[in-house]
């Protein structure tokens, strides 16, 4: 997992905010390959670079999440953007739709850790993120970064500083921070995964 | 079908190394973590610890941390269990193990190996 | 670590009858908690997770119950391939753990 999402990521970034915002209104559009649904419209309007990149991948997975998104690009007349891409892109194998729903012994989103997954939502909804950070300094977080969250202002910006470190973060690290939100806000984990 | 056949039983010495293999099929090696799970003569299980192959990060119960390396080799499918010095007390049965799924992290081992049985005697 | 606590140690039942074998947290461990069926030579067995979920291919005499820190796994009728040792699992912190099982044996 990785390579792919960050050539989106990548490709988002170096849009400007107006084709951003043409990006996401032709997203809303696109033909989409049978079984897979819309990312739906009120969500993604608000969406910046990385929410837009973790949301792609969560619906349609990295390989067909990439494919999309050079679709729109080339759509857009951006082919030099939409090339680099795909030529960035490992050819991966494909997926059930994220409009099917799969039993949850089946993984639906196998290597997608549940942290990304979800990113959108714990960012919106964690609360308690001084304790999420007291449990992972010295394991996952330095103290640079353990300070750069603290600093900001609201849980919602807290969160989204913290998921700025997430990119270089492993499995267990990942799941170090799903063990500290199980024990701070396991209601929210339980939420979640029904979800 | 998810398998996982483990090595053969080994007879060891204390200060001998040893490394024995779990080598899996019938789903992409990379999208699960692989567990080790160890059983002493006659006694109860005990987690040991985990590699995800995707990218090879593991976790280890601080009980075996500095004991063990657990590895894995995607190109061949197989994770590893590691001694660089048996001791006497190493003699047990080793299973490797797979969850149920492993996206939320909730490790319920739905599939298991054979167990490999390791002996350190002098 | 989380302590799992399992109860009774030996159970001796005859086939036919009802089991019941407990498991306690040291804390809360929510729903995450497994159970496991091992035979003498043979690698546990899946058969319950998340508290009171019945794994596939796993006969309905079985269920699991509980939630915090009090768990139960039952056997409605026992038969006669039901004797084995039972283990708990928690699975919401590491390190994963395992209670010291049960022994269901014939009476």
């Known amino acids: 997992m990785g390579r792919a999402r960050d050539a989106i990521l990548d490709a988002l970034e170096n849009l400007t905010a107006e084709e951003l915002k043409k990006f996401k209104l032709k997203l809303l559009s696109v033909p989409l390959r049978e079984g897979y649904g819309r990312i739906p419209r009120g969500a993604l309007l608000s969406m910046d670079a990385l929410d837009l990149t973790d949301k792609l991948v969560s619906f349609y997975l990295e390989t067909y999440g990439a494919e999309l998104t050079a679709n729109v690009l080339r759509d857009m007349g951006l082919q030099e953007m939409a090339g680099q891409l795909q030529a960035a892109t490992h050819q991966g194998s494909g997926a059930a739709p994220a409009g099917i729903q799969a039993p949850p012994q089946s993984a639906a989103k196998p290597g997608l850790h549940f942290i990304d997954q979800h990113r959108a939502a714990l960012i919106a909804r964690v609360t308690n993120v001084e304790w999420l950070l007291d449990a992972l300094y010295g394991k996952v977080l330095t103290d640079e970064q353990y300070q750069a969250v603290r600093a900001e202002p609201t849980n919602p910006s807290k969160m989204r500083k913290l998921f700025s470190f997430t990119p270089a973060w492993n499995w267990t690290c990942k799941d170090l921070l799903l063990q500290a939100l199980r024990e701070s806000q396991s209601y929210l984990v339980e939420d979640l995964e029904r979800s | 079908e998810v398998q996982l056949v483990q090595s053969g039983a080994e007879v060891k010495k204390p200060g001998e190394s040893l490394k024995i293999s779990c080598k899996i099929s019938?789903?992409?090696?990379?999208?699960?973590?692989i567990h080790w799970v160890h059983q002493m003569p006659g006694k109860g299980l005990e987690w040991m610890g985990y590699i995800y192959p995707g990218d090879s990060s593991a976790m280890y119960n601080e009980k075996f941390q500095g004991q063990v390396t657990i590895s894995a080799d995607k190109s061949i499918s197989t994770a590893y269990l590691q001694w660089s010095s048996l001791k006497a007390s190493d003699t047990a049965m080793y299973y490797c193990?797979?969850?149920?799924?492993?996206?939320?992290?909730?490790?319920?081992?739905?599939?298991w190996g054979q167990g490999t049985l390791v002996t350190v005697s002098s | 670590e989380i302590v799992l606590t399992q109860s009774p140690a030996t159970l001796s039942l005859s086939p036919g009858e009802r089991a019941t074998l407990s498991c306690h947290a040291s804390?809360?461990?929510?729903?995450?908690l497994s159970w496991y069926q091992q035979k003498p030579g043979q690698a546990p067995r899946l058969l319950i997770y998340?508290?009171?979920n019945l794994h596939t291919g796993i006969p309905a005499r079985f269920s699991g119950s509980g939630s915090g820190t009090d768990f139960t796994l039952t056997i409605s009728s026992l038969e006669p391939e039901d004797f084995a040792v039972y283990y708990c699992?928690?699975?919401?912190?590491?390190?994963?753990?395992f209670g010291q099982g049960t022994k269901l044996e014939i009476k």
């Open positions: 699992q928690q699975g919401q912190s590491y390190p994963l753990t």
């Open positions: 804390q809360n461990i929510n729903v995450y």
């Open positions: 193990a797979r969850p149920l799924y492993s996206y939320a992290s909730y490790y319920w081992f739905a599939y």
């Open positions: 019938g789903y992409s090696f990379t999208d699960q973590t």
């Open positions: 998340k508290s009171s």
